[in-house]
């Protein structure tokens, strides 16, 4: 059984308030910011996590460089609108009535507009490429050991079904993890690749979302795998719609 039952905490999301006020006195946890109930046996959606993060602001994080081949999260933090299931609403607006469309991981995929901007559907991010550079080690990691450990990490820590980890590439010191998950492949209860990638990103930055003080401890054959740089690329099922002005900027 989990500590959530004993201490009434949420193992998978420290940005929650928990109390034994569920049915039969069971522990129930609600996300900060939104107040939405969360399932502590699995990952919380990225939208609810961003909302919780904005309700308790920290220092701004460094932004990654844009890529001409894929979307990267170039706009940084914002306070998102989430639907009743905790997913990003297709259209996001700020306090000054500037609006834009986002994909399923909350990354902007159109130019910014006004309140008349229409976002007909939430476009799914079906392919995520996580690009890492590890710190120098005595020698290169064995590729098959690294592959097995990263697959096990995503399965055990992030509860992501192994079929969604498409590939692990390694050319020292660069590691690339490919996550793929089409709309048709994702069954009820499956962890979303966008949520798994976000938890992984926060772990790598030393900002673990899991309860407890320990943080990520990742080793390959006993050798710590320490990451010094992370880039995450998002590919959508429908290509993004940016004006040429942005592409040539």
């Amino acid at each position: 059984h989990t500590a959530a039952q004993d201490n009434c905490t949420c193992p998978t999301n420290k940005m929650t308030v928990c109390s034994p006020d569920g049915p039969g006195g069971r522990c129930q946890c609600r996300a900060l910011g939104s107040g939405m109930a969360v399932d502590c046996s699995t990952l919380t959606s990225k939208c609810l996590l961003l909302k919780a993060r904005m309700s308790a602001p920290k220092n701004a994080r460094t932004l990654v460089r844009p890529s001409e081949h894929a979307l990267v999260d170039n706009d940084g933090l914002y306070d998102p609108d989430c639907d009743p299931e905790g997913r990003f609403k297709a259209r996001q607006c700020n306090q000054t009535s500037v609006c834009w469309c986002v994909n399923s991981v909350g990354v902007r995929r159109t130019d910014k507009g006004d309140l008349s901007l229409r976002c007909d559907e939430l476009v799914r991010t079906h392919h995520i490429l996580i690009d890492l550079r590890h710190r120098p080690t005595a020698g290169a990691f064995n590729h098959s050991d690294l592959d097995a450990e990263l697959r096990r990490l995503f399965r055990e820590r992030y509860r992501l079904h192994p079929k969604f980890v498409a590939a692990v590439h390694y050319e020292q010191p660069t590691i690339q993890i490919e996550l793929r998950q089409n709309t048709s492949q994702k069954a009820a209860g499956d962890v979303d690749i966008g949520d798994a990638a976000y938890y992984f990103e926060r772990d790598i930055k030393g900002e673990s979302l899991f309860q407890g003080r320990g943080g990520l401890d990742l080793r390959v054959r006993g050798e710590p795998l320490q990451v010094e740089r992370t880039l995450i690329y998002y590919l959508d099922e429908i290509p993004p719609k940016f004006s040429m002005k942005r592409l040539t900027a």
Partner: nanobody, 126 residues
């Protein structure tokens, strides 16, 4: 579904020995912080010993030199070898695991552990 099942508890005379075991399922024990805690009647649950994914171990001052924590990666089990037992070691002993791939931090805190066994009773008489 992660499950931890302790065994090996019992009654023993002071100065005697016991070996507790914890069978782990649904989790690779070698990839995360695992530990033993104990709770005596009317007292707070306290950390006894932990083992990190690296294999490094730490024991509480009250049991140092007497208790040894270890794990068997092949069998996915955690053990606690207890020697020179004292009456004050009498308690319910719990096996605990942190969320997969989590590190161990000191001082030991039950709040850092997600999964718990049901416990096994150890009674030491003088």
């Amino acid at each position: 579904q992660v499950q931890l099942q302790e065994s090996g508890g019992g009654s023993v005379q002071a100065g005697g020995s016991l070996r507790l075991s914890c069978a782990v399922s649904g989790l690779t024990s070698s990839t995360t912080c695992m530990g033993w805690f104990r709770q005596a009647p009317g007292k707070e649950r306290e950390g006894v010993a932990v083992i990190r994914s690296s294999g490094e171990t730490t024991a509480a001052d009250s049991v140092k030199g007497r208790f040894t924590i270890s794990r068997d990666n092949a069998k996915n089990t955690l053990s606690l070898q207890m020697t020179s037992l004292k009456p004050e070691d009498t308690a319910m002993y719990y096996c605990a695991a942190a969320w997969p791939y989590s590190g161990c931090l000191l001082p030991l805190s039950s709040g850092d552990f997600t999964y718990w066994g049901q416990g096994t009773q150890v009674t030491v008489s003088s």
